[in-house]
């Protein structure tokens, strides 16, 4: 009889442990859901406020046609500049036409004057070809003037109304570019 009671007691204790475990899992699951919900709500509110503002470009970015441009206020080497742009959901500036080049140089004149700004152009070490960061070649009128005699990697930058080249490890301002949001109205 005592053995029977002892067995029942052990079974009850086992059941209690399982229930505690289930409760712990549920609490953990609930906490995880709450965190996800918080993230979703914040993300939705962010998206809604962006949509409400319905500006094609973020604050402090300049718009021209389908593009938004950000002119940095800090110096960095070319690779860090690329990294900074990616963090903003953009890439270093890729100049597709003379019209775009004129817009950029005109805007820079108004904002900061004659400084150096990295763009998304680099020279292939083996072939010596200039390539934009998406792998495309610049149009013939948008090739940097040969100015760098560097043995290191060479990258492109804008100064005044010219495209020039320099050792990628030198410090310059930089320009990021992203697509402007299309209005669905």
């Amino acid at each position: 009889k005592l053995l029977q009671v002892s067995t029942i007691a052990m079974q009850q204790q086992e059941k209690l442990i399982q229930q505690e475990r289930a409760l712990l899992n549920f609490t953990e699951w609930k906490r995880s859901c709450a965190l996800q919900m918080k993230y979703c709500q914040a993300f939705m509110q962010n998206s809604l406020s962006s949509a409400h503002n319905s500006s094609p470009c973020p604050n402090n970015w300049i718009q021209n046609r389908e593009s938004c441009y950000y002119v940095s206020e800090i110096w960095s080497i070319w690779h860090t500049s690329q990294e900074n742009c990616l963090k903003e959901g953009s890439t270093l500036l890729q100049i597709e036409s003379k019209e775009e080049m004129d817009f950029i140089t005109g805007s820079l004149r108004k904002i900061k004057g004659s400084y150096d700004y990295w763009v998304g152009l680099s020279q292939d070490g083996h072939s010596g070809r200039w390539l934009w960061q998406d792998g495309s070649s610049p149009s013939p009128g948008l090739l940097p003037a040969e100015r760098s005699q560097s043995a290191n990697q060479v990258c492109g930058y804008v100064k005044s109304n010219s495209l020039l080249s320099s050792n990628c490890s030198t410090w310059k301002y930089f320009i990021c570019e992203k697509y402007a949001l299309r209005s669905s109205v």
Epitope: N46, E88, G89, S90, Q133, D134, K178, Y179
Partner: nanobody, 121 residues
Framework: QVQLQESGGGLVQPGGSLRLSCAAS????????MGWYRQAPGKQRELVAA???????AYGTSVMGRFTISRDNAKNTVYLQMDSLKPEDTAVYYC???????????????WGQGTQVTVSS
């Protein structure tokens, strides 16, 4: 916490191809950019390729014309197609996600565990 699950690494002969995949546990659009970085022994981690949520692409200079980055939004997955592989492409390849800030709070990058790519005959 975001999980980035990489796959597709391995041993391949020079001139061969590999395709890496990186599946994220969260929607692609909650990131400003996703991409691949690599680190060879004794070297710094370098950008291989990245794609922004707007679809802009950036490649590392040494892989241009050989590697192609793409994404599948429905699967929250980013791919790296690596062709014409060279011994100097040997490295650990890491998937990376740059989170879009929520309410101005900045979060550091998310990284995968890394997948080894060895190019050797």
């Amino acid at each position: 916490q975001v999980q980035l699950q990489e796959s597709g690494g391995g041993l391949v002969q020079p001139g061969g191809s590999l395709r890496l995949s990186c599946a994220a546990s969260r929607s692609f659009f909650s990131f400003n950019a996703m991409g691949w970085y690599r680190q060879a022994p004794g070297k710094q981690r370098e950008l291989v390729a990245a794609i922004t949520n707007g679809g802009r692409i950036a490649y590392g200079t040494s892989v241009m014309g050989r590697f192609t980055i793409s994404r599948d939004n429905a699967k929250n997955t980013v791919y790296l197609q690596m062709d014409s592989l060279k011994p100097e492409d040997t490295a650990v390849y890491y998937c990376n996600a740059k989170p879009a800030p929520v309410y101005g709070s900045t979060v550091g990058d998310y990284w995968g565990q890394g997948t080894q790519v060895t190019v050797s005959s």
